[in-house]
Each structure stands twice: as structure tokens, then as C-alpha cells.
């Protein structure tokens, strides 16, 4: 004999207390597949979480983060505080990027400026806390007629070894 529970559709649960009736999920719960013997409790988007998609009888709620925070982890399992560009989040809060590093987003860490000299290039635009350096053409590219780009400043840019 076929198990009657296997035919209970999504949005219901097979209620053994009630002679295996396919009972609609109670408030604030859902079943996303058929044949369930219980409904799962809906996720509640509280505090720094806010509701991106309401829970329905067949699907869980989805959360994102309130302004000033951003999602981390699968399904936005955590909210992390935003920082300004040029900062990174530490245990003590948002801190400015150290000299020689930058962060052009409101999240994540400060990363070292690109070392142009590793590619045999020169620094065209200096780096800041918010922006990486812009590497210019290599000195070899600056032979007459090769380029009309203004030569870079002397190669004692902050955070870079002399070329």
C-alpha cells in the first residue's frame, strides 16, 4: 500500500496526530517539498536582518541586511557592518587602511597597492587609501614616438621600492 504521506504536497505536512491528513503548514512555517511529516519554522529576519522575501507555505523567508550592513555567508547567514571606502573592519570597528594599502569597497579588507615595478612598469597615478595605483607604461615604452604619455614622477612613490 502506498504511504498516504508521500502524496502530501509542498505547503502541507502529513499530520500523524490527525490520521495522516495533509494539513496546511501552521503560521510561520513551510514545507518546500511533498511528503513532509513536519513543516520547518520560517526564518525570521530580525535586528540587522531585513526581509527580502516573505516566508510562504512552500518556501522559507530570505533576508538581507539593513543599510549600513552587508551579507556574509550562504543565504546571508550573517550581516557585517559596512565601512567607508579606504577602511576595513577590525574587531575594534572600522579602521583606515594602513599606508600602502587600499580598499575601494564598503566591505572586505585593505589590500596592498599593486607593485608596478614587478611588471617592469612605472607608477602613473599614485595610490590612496581608496584606490590602487595606476601603472603606466614601462620606461622602454617611453622611447621617442612610442607614446605621448607624460613620463611618471620620480620613482620614489610611497609604498614602492625605487626602480
Amino acid at each position: 500500500l502506498q504511504d498516504p504521506c508521500s502524496n502530501c504536497p509542498a505547503g502541507t505536512f502529513c499530520d500523524n496526530n490527525r490520521n495522516q491528513i495533509c494539513s496546511p503548514c501552521p503560521p510561520n512555517s513551510f514545507s518546500s517539498a511533498g511528503g513532509q511529516r513536519t513543516c520547518d519554522i520560517c526564518r525570521q529576519c530580525k535586528g540587522v536582518f531585513r526581509t527580502r522575501k516573505e516566508c510562504s507555505s512552500t518556501s522559507n523567508a530570505e533576508c538581507d541586511c539593513t543599510p549600513g550592513f552587508h551579507c556574509l555567508g550562504a543565504g546571508c547567514s550573517m550581516c557585517e557592518q559596512d565601512c567607508k571606502q579606504g577602511q576595513e573592519l577590525t574587531k575594534k570597528g572600522c579602521k583606515d587602511c594602513c599606508f600602502g594599502t587600499f580598499n575601494d569597497q564598503k566591505r572586505g579588507i585593505c589590500r596592498p597597492w599593486t607593485n608596478c615595478s614587478l611588471d617592469g612598469k612605472s607608477v602613473l597615478v599614485n595610490g590612496t587609501k581608496e584606490r590602487d595605483v595606476v601603472c603606466g607604461p614601462s620606461p622602454a615604452d617611453l622611447s621617442p614616438g612610442a607614446s605621448s604619455v607624460t613620463p611618471p614622477a620620480p620613482a620614489r612613490e610611497p609604498g614602492h621600492s625605487p626602480q
Partner: antibody
């Protein structure tokens, strides 16, 4: 919107059978159990049985066991309740009701009056 | 069978005044999932019953917030904070927990 439209009034002789239909619209018919309830004049509501969601297996009140048959036609989104061996005490208004919330009949048909008279 | 007992049988009310109906069950209606399986329906004159409250205290969609349900286990109450003329009819409690599902005998609410 959800609607349950029942068949019209019936007059039957004692010993006969009656089959009441309940056509559902505005929702996925197979996703919710359908119950049948009757109300004799001046009496409380009396539950008769249900047709479950999914494959539509049935459960009946012991009071009507052997006399009532609840069926459904999913393709026509219609539930049926047949009561046999009618007697005068079966004269009542018969309702279909959807269990659309947990343990709750959120929509009812308009009722079908069945008169049993010789 | 679970026997549902309602009181009072009749309740004359004054519009604007509160009203309260009691329902007792012969067995606990608390499901293993933590919800009380008790519903309240109103049957207005000449109409089909309509759902007011389910799972003891949850108001059905479109039901005015002057209606509230409370209680747990075997003792339940339906309260109307301020009765309006349209609230007249017979109120039934119902248990959908065990077969057979059973209804209370009804409470007739009428305007004084």
C-alpha cells in the same frame, strides 16, 4: 478568489441516495483537504468526513461509516459527497468546506438542502 | 469523541459593549507541534459559517481585530471588544484535532 459552488437542493425518498457536488475555483484543488459538514434544522454542525490533499484518501465519521462516500474529480476541481439509505433524520443542509489553514475551514460552500420525504 | 461545550447558549448584547463566549473541550486540544487546534466560526442568519479564529488565537484573513481568541488545552474564549450590529448570529467552536471533528452547540448572539 477562492469559491466553493455546491449543487442545488434535492428532495429524496427514504431509502434513496443523494450525491452533492462542490466545485472549487480560485486555488489548486489537490493541495487542500476538503471536508463535508451537515446541519439539521436547529442542530449543531456535524462533521461527516474529508477527502485529503494529494491522492485524496478519505476519512469518515463513525456516525456515517458505510453510508457516506466522499470522492473527487481533480481534473474538474470537484468534490462529491454521496449519502445512501436516507432517512428523515438526514434532512439537513450539507456543506463542503476547505481546510485551507491548519485545522481551519477557511472557505465554505453555500450549502445544499436535502429534504427526505415520502 | 471530543465533546465541545459552549456557554452561554444565548447572549444578548448592546452595540459598543464587549462580549465573551466560552468553549470547553473534554480533552486537551494542544497538538504536539505546540498549537491549540481550536477554531471559531460565525454563522450569520441564512448564511454559511465563516471562519473567525483558528489555532486558538489566530485571526482569519479579513476578520476585524475586535475579535480575539485565547486559551489553551481545554478552555478557550472568544472575545468581541465592541459588538457591532453585523456580529449577530450563532458562534460555534470546533476542534479539528481528532476524528470525528466536533463542534460546540453554538452561542446565539443577538442585539438587546
Amino acid at each position: 478568489q477562492v469559491q466553493l459552488a455546491q449543487s442545488g437542493a434535492e428532495v429524496k425518498k427514504p431509502g434513496a441516495s443523494v450525491k452533492v457536488s462542490c466545485k472549487a475555483s480560485g486555488y489548486t484543488f489537490s493541495s487542500f483537504p476538503m471536508h463535508w459538514v451537515r446541519q439539521a434544522p436547529g442542530q449543531r454542525l456535524e462533521w461527516m468526513g474529508w477527502s485529503n490533499a494529494g491522492i485524496g484518501n478519505t476519512k469518515y465519521s463513525q456516525e456515517f461509516q458505510g453510508r457516506v462516500t466522499i470522492t473527487r474529480d481533480t481534473s474538474a476541481s470537484t468534490a462529491y459527497m454521496e449519502l445512501s439509505s436516507l432517512r428523515s433524520e438526514d434532512m439537513a443542509v450539507y456543506y463542503c468546506a476547505r481546510e485551507g489553514l491548519t485545522g481551519a475551514f477557511d472557505y465554505w460552500g453555500q450549502g445544499t438542502l436535502v429534504t427526505v420525504s415520502s | 469523541d471530543i465533546v465541545m461545550t459552549q456557554s452561554p447558549l444565548s447572549l444578548p448584547v448592546t452595540p459598543g459593549e464587549p462580549a465573551s463566549i466560552s468553549c470547553r473541550s473534554s480533552q486537551s486540544l494542544l497538538h504536539s507541534n505546540g498549537y491549540n487546534y481550536l477554531g471559531w466560526h460565525l454563522q450569520k442568519p441564512g448564511q454559511s459559517p465563516q471562519l473567525l479564529i483558528y489555532l486558538g488565537s489566530y485571526r482569519a484573513s479579513g476578520v476585524p481585530d475586535r475579535f480575539s481568541g485565547s486559551g489553551s488545552g481545554t478552555d478557550f474564549t472568544l472575545k468581541i471588544s465592541r459588538v457591532e450590529a453585523e456580529d449577530v448570529g450563532v458562534y460555534y467552536c470546533m476542534q479539528p484535532l481528532q476524528i470525528p471533528l466536533t463542534f460546540g452547540g453554538g452561542t446565539k448572539v443577538e442585539i438587546k
